[in-house]
Interface confidence: low
């Protein structure tokens, strides 16, 4: 008799990443009988929600339901109806909501309450919406990339199945850049983690990991730009801000009220004799870099060594995956290749920032001007953060791998979050069975 395929025994999970600038929904899928195996979960869909991040809905919470509809309906289509009720849905909000919570816990709670109420109306197994900590964001990003790279697998392989694989079980560090925060997470080499707040202990697949992590709130690319503008307008002689981080010929009017809306600019706030000012781009990488460095306080360190702002950072160790905005920005600038040295990246940034705005607009006609205008700042900021902030050097630059996806799944905290919340990363090594369940009879 002919072999007949049994119905696919798979499970699904949904995670919404409620970031500061936008929300993305990820759908994951895995074979039901292999839940504890490493590397079996993969992403089948990403849906980017149209509109800003959820923290921007604080004055219009009634619009959140409509905002989430398209992507939740997409999930309804992708996941078979028979699986809906057992598919967990998690929403994790990151630094945009951490900032809102700093301003008002009540407002943050109201936003989350409406989000929870909206998501509860779908036929999935809604598990809650919460603001994840910076420490969790770093930890889950680290878990995600190492899970996808096969670093937790039982056996070392003599062949490579994924890019960036170094054929050993040394984990990769994780560098995550968002709009409002940035995370650095890695296993230091025989180094005491001097600050308990930055120490994580994991037991995964029978192995112990002592992991360093820190999340720098206000040092995501968007909030760093607001910080820089607030700092620079303090010393402007009038309502014109000649800014080296924008292309020559670029002009934009900024409301002072918008500048001081975020808690990230509070330290630079002052009474200005104008309600608006105009940014006028002058496109100078070196000056832009110098201005950015003023955001990092490196004069104070209560530990053996620090990143900046008095935050402990052990000596860098091993390879790093740099993802989220680290990847998107460098990809746009065509600087993600492993072959491009740090010196070459700097050289190319100098040329890019110096290009006139009109020329840039013509060259990248399909890109929204809001985003296009900020690539000079973002690229310079990435270099400043990695080199001066985290102490990468021209030599260690080659250990940074700019990663968008690994094996078809986005690098980021969402997969690690789901793996943890669905108990799919066992602390102990699962007992291996001689044969997996056959899918054919």
């Amino acid at each position: 008799t002919q072999n007949k395929a049994l119905p696919e025994n798979v499970k699904y999970g949904i995670v919404l990443d409620a970031g500061s600038s936008h929300t993305s929904l990820y759908i994951y899928k895995w074979p039901a009988e292999k839940e504890n195996d490493t590397g079996v979960v993969h992403q089948v869909e990403e849906c980017r929600v149209k509109g800003p991040g959820i923290s921007k809905f604080v004055q219009k919470v009634n619009e959140i339901g409509i905002y989430l509809t398209d992507c939740m309906e997409r999930a309804r289509e992708v996941i078979p109806r028979s699986q809906h009720q057992e598919t967990p849905v998690y929403l994790g909000a990151t630094a945009g909501m951490r900032l809102l919570r700093m301003e008002s816990e009540e407002l943050a709670d109201r936003v989350l309450d409406v989000v929870e109420r909206s998501l509860s109306n779908y036929p999935f197994d809604f598990q809650g919406a919460r603001i994840i900590t910076g420490q969790e964001e770093g930890a889950y990003g680290w878990i995600t990339i190492n899970y996808l790279l096969g670093k937790f697998s039982q056996k070392t392989r003599w062949f490579s199945i994924v890019p960036y694989e170094t054929n050993n079980q040394e984990t990769f560090g994780a560098l995550d850049l968002g709009g409002a925060s940035t995370q650095v997470t890695f296993v230091p080499q025989n180094q005491t983690i001097e600050s308990p707040d930055n120490a994580l202990q994991f037991r995964l697949y029978g192995k112990d990991y002592n992991v360093y992590t820190h999340s720098f709130l206000c040092y995501g690319k968007d909030q760093a730009l607001w910080q820089k503008l607030a700092k620079d307008i303090q010393v402007a002689s009038n309502e014109i801000l000649r800014d080296p981080c924008f292309h020559p010929g670029y002009k934009k009017v900024v409301n002072v009220s918008d500048l001081y809306k975020t808690p990230c600019t509070k330290r630079f706030e002052m009474t200005l004799p104008f309600q608006q000012f105009e940014i006028q781009g002058i496109g100078n990488y070196q000056q832009c870099h110098q201005s950015i460095l003023e955001l990092f306080n490196t004069s104070y360190c209560p530990y053996s060594q620090c990143a900046f702002n008095g935050i402990f950072l052990p000596p860098l160790q091993g390879d790093f995956g740099a993802f989220s905005a680290f990847y998107f920005v460098m990809k746009f600038l065509n600087l993600t290749s492993e072959k491009v040295s740090q010196e070459k990246v700097t050289e190319m940034m100098k040329k890019f920032c110096a290009q006139p705005w009109e020329e840039i607009k013509t060259s990248y006609a399909g890109v929204k001007e809001k985003y296009l205008s900020e690539y000079c700042f973002s690229g310079t900021y990435i270099l400043s953060l990695l080199l001066q902030g985290y102490h990468f050097t021209a030599d260690s630059w080659e250990h940074i791998h700019f990663i968008g996806k690994i094996q078809g799944s986005d690098a980021g905290w969402t997969l690690g979050y789901m793996l943890n919340l669905t108990n799919m990363i066992p602390a102990e090594q699962p007992l291996s069975t001689p044969l997996s369940h056959s899918t054919y009879v």
Partner: nanobody, 124 residues
Amino acid sequence: QVKLQESGGGLVQAGGSLRLSCTASEESFNKYGVGWFRQAPGKERAFVVAIRPSGVITSYADSVKGRFTISRDSAKNTAYLQMNSLKPEDTALYYCAANSRNTNYYRPNGYDYWGRGTQVTVSS
């Protein structure tokens, strides 16, 4: 219905240690997040520490970081709170709670099931 029973409280001098246990009536306890809260006289119930279902990530209140450690033994359906370097301000009634929703770990309303509490008194 998960029933939780705390034990291990008592009177201890400042600088001393205690280990609280929270035993659950149900075998599916390892599917729940576990939190410890404390309530001092005249004060609201306050978050102390939580552990996620898999035990991979733990969360601590700033006031206990580096002094308290949460762990769990799934085989025994028990969660533990090891409290070192105790201070008089740690004096409170300590509650264990189970969270089936993996959300809102830091506030009491995120938890579905509660124990009756065990008293911890730290004398100076």
